[in-house]
């Protein structure tokens, strides 16, 4: 069920769940933001200060890297 994740526990969970995609600590914002200091929702706010389930954690995974031949 939902649980709070802070510090190393949070990094562990992001590494495991996001895997090769990597992760963000803040949700990416659009380039058209009118203020550089526009408030961002961060994973610490969502998962450490409040409880956080797996699906919410996955929202901080980076998108798939574009497909290209190795």
């Amino acid at each position: 069920g939902p649980e709070t994740l802070c510090g190393a526990e949070l990094v562990d969970a992001l590494q495991f769940v996001c895997g090769d995609r990597g992760f963000y600590f803040n949700k990416p914002t659009g380039y058209g933001s009118s203020s550089r200091r526009a408030p961002q929702t961060g994973i610490v706010d969502e998962c450490c200060f409040r409880s956080c389930d797996l699906r919410r954690l996955e929202m901080y995974c980076a998108p798939l890297k574009p497909a290209k031949s190795a």
Epitope: E3, L5, A8, E9, D12, A13, Q15, F16, V17, C18, G19, D20, R21, L54, E58, L64, K65, A67, A70
Partner: antibody, heavy 118, light 106 residues
Framework: QVQLVESGGGVVQPGRSLRLSCAAS????????MTWVRQAPGKGLEWVAY????????YYRDSVKGRFTISRDNSKNTLYLQMNSLRAEDTAVYYC???????????WGQGTLVTVSS | DIVMTQSPDSLAVSLGERATITCRAS?????MHWFQQKPGQSPKPWIY???KLASGVPDRFSGSGSGTSYSLTISSLQAEDAATYYC?????????FGQGTKVEIK
Amino acid sequence: QVQLVESGGGVVQPGRSLRLSCAASGFTFSNYYMTWVRQAPGKGLEWVAYISSGGGSTYYRDSVKGRFTISRDNSKNTLYLQMNSLRAEDTAVYYCAREDYGYWFAYWGQGTLVTVSS
Amino acid sequence: DIVMTQSPDSLAVSLGERATITCRASSSVSYMHWFQQKPGQSPKPWIYGTSKLASGVPDRFSGSGSGTSYSLTISSLQAEDAATYYCLQRSSYPPTFGQGTKVEIK
């Protein structure tokens, strides 16, 4: 060098319980999240469970959720898998494995066989 | 869950010949990872990040691919390469492995 040694496997009847252990050495156990992976006889590999470095966070594959519990004792450098309500389909070799970021499932134990049979 | 399908299930190749194993993912993944397993042994990391050989892996092994299709190739099969090879995706939770491909000496 990194060493993982599983124990606790055996033959058990359906519906019964078993606890597996994995003794870790050669690295700072408390710094790493750990996983269990299983392999049914003659079959492929299947991730089973995850536990964070401090033990506060756990995830499970759907088929074992509510029946299996992963835990750890960092003072003893030991990982556990408590398996309840065992089913025939849980018959497998169970491996504990350590991941390094980007080097997934980098280290494996030798495995311990769990046979669920009446 | 992403389903990983390896082909063929098994193949027999003569010593010195080329062997290729394919792994297809049900959805696109960023990278593929490969493990080698011999009977009675635990799996060993073999190829990471689609094409990077794990420590100690001979350079007759190579990996390639992108999107949903990846492959492992042995350019000149040696006796010690007889084993089962598994692919792994770590781009989507939960981690999933292929069913394995058994490589035998003809």
